[in-house]
Interface confidence: low
């Protein structure tokens, strides 16, 4: 069964900056990745970035840089300052659309007691929805 993992960490060098990393553990080819915060995409969450293998990457504030890390994982850096900046308990969600598995989404947030620059290893987060 495919799984999605989500890792959130606060950067030690810029304490109000977050890095979100997400990956897809499946055999299908990924056609789209959507990163949102405040809840799952389409369920009250706000889209931060959309990564398409062929059409490129689109991102919206406070997303600072989205990129493909590997063929099945992405990372996103969030701007740390301003009214729309994330707080420690913000939920981030990643949705992977793949063929033939369909859409798989998981969410994660900063570990409650994490020190800046530290985070748990990227383990599969609970799968919220498989379309």
């Amino acid at each position: 069964t495919p799984e999605v993992w989500v890792q959130v960490r606060m950067e030690a060098t810029e304490l109000s900056s977050f890095t979100i990393r997400c990956g897809f553990l499946g055999s299908g080819s990924i056609s789209l990745v959507t990163v949102s915060w405040g809840g799952p995409n389409g369920a009250g969450g706000t889209t931060l970035a959309v990564l398409h293998p062929e059409r490129g990457i689109r991102q919206w504030a406070p997303a600072r840089q989205a990129r493909w890390e590997t063929q099945s994982s992405i990372s996103l850096i969030l701007e740390g300052s301003g009214a729309s900046s994330p707080c420690a308990n913000t939920t981030f969600c990643c949705k992977f659309a793949s063929f033939p598995e369909g859409s798989w989404e998981a969410c994660g947030s900063l570990p409650p007691s994490s020190d800046p620059g530290l985070s748990a290893p990227p383990t599969p987060a609970p799968i919220l929805r498989a379309d």
């Epitope: 900056s17 490129g56 990129r67 493909w68 890390e69 590997t70 063929q71």
Partner: antibody
Framework: EVQLQQSGPELVKPGASVKISCKAS????????INWVKQSHGKSLEWIGY????????GYNQKFKSKATLSADNPSSTAYMELRSLTSEDSAVYYC?????????????WGQGTPVTVSS | DIQMTQSPASLSVSVGETVTIICRVS??????LAWYQQKQGKSPQLLVY???NLAEGVPSRFSGSGSGTQYSLKINSLQSEDFGSYYC?????????FGGGTKLEIK
């Protein structure tokens, strides 16, 4: 005008370390990745890694993970690459290059290159 | 890692001719590919990004095409300033890798 100015040629002894600099001008330094690329004499190009100056985040080619350390000093808009435990295999020209996020990560501006010669 | 195989390795051509350089990739990179030109003793220069888009200031005699695992760079009506080496590079996840290069020489 965007420019990447690299430090001058280096002649170093085997086993030593060297730190190459790449000073950026003409754009907001923290907005773009700086990549480092190796070119041995008469050979192709090898990607070493990138640094994202805004948070100091970096990504490496595993082949160079134990050889190179990338860093950046934002106030001076300068990226650095330190190469350690040098051998003759490390003799090459090293380039820094800006990664253009609007051009699907292609490297749109390059430094002039820093030749490194490892010799006893 | 993704492997990039460029062909031919070298090419001897005359001014005014048309040349095509091929870059074969070990897996689908979804057009996440760039082409660079490098002249002797100089830094590489970006020619094409996203497989088909010409970089700023690049003459229209250059064109990029391809998708999936095969890409090509075409140079129409070759000029004397076009001689040098050409490299493809993918950006579909790290490590970004370059092709082995194609050396374009004057016949």
């Amino acid at each position: 005008e965007v420019q990447l100015q690299q430090s001058g040629p280096e002649l170093v002894k085997p086993g030593a370390s060297v730190k190459i600099s790449c000073k950026a001008s003409g754009y907001t330094f923290t907005d773009y990745n700086i990549n480092w690329v190796k070119q041995s004499h008469g050979k192709s190009l090898e990607w070493i890694g990138y640094i994202y100056p805004y948070i100091g985040g970096s990504g490496y080619n595993q082949k160079f993970k134990s050889k190179a350390t990338l860093s950046a000093d934002n106030p001076s808009s300068t990226a650095y690459m330190e190469l350690r435990s040098l051998t003759s295999e490390d003799s090459a020209v090293y380039y820094c290059a800006r990664e253009d996020k609007t051009a699907r990560n292609a490297m749109d501006y390059w430094g002039q290159g820093t030749p490194v010669t490892v010799s006893s | 890692d993704i492997q990039m195989t460029q062909s031919p390795a070298s090419l001897s051509v005359s001014v005014g001719e048309t040349v095509t350089i091929i870059c074969r990739v070990s897996e689908n990179i979804y057009s996440n590919l760039a082409w660079y030109q490098q002249k002797q003793g100089k830094s590489p220069q970006l020619l094409v990004y996203e497989a088909t888009n010409l970089a700023e200031g690049v003459p229209s005699r250059f064109s990029g095409s391809g998708s999936g695992t095969q890409y090509s760079l075409k140079i129409n009506s070759l000029q004397s300033e076009d001689f040098g080496s050409y490299y493809c590079q993918h950006f579909w996840g790290t490590p970004y890798t370059f092709g082995g290069g194609t050396k374009l020489e004057i016949k």
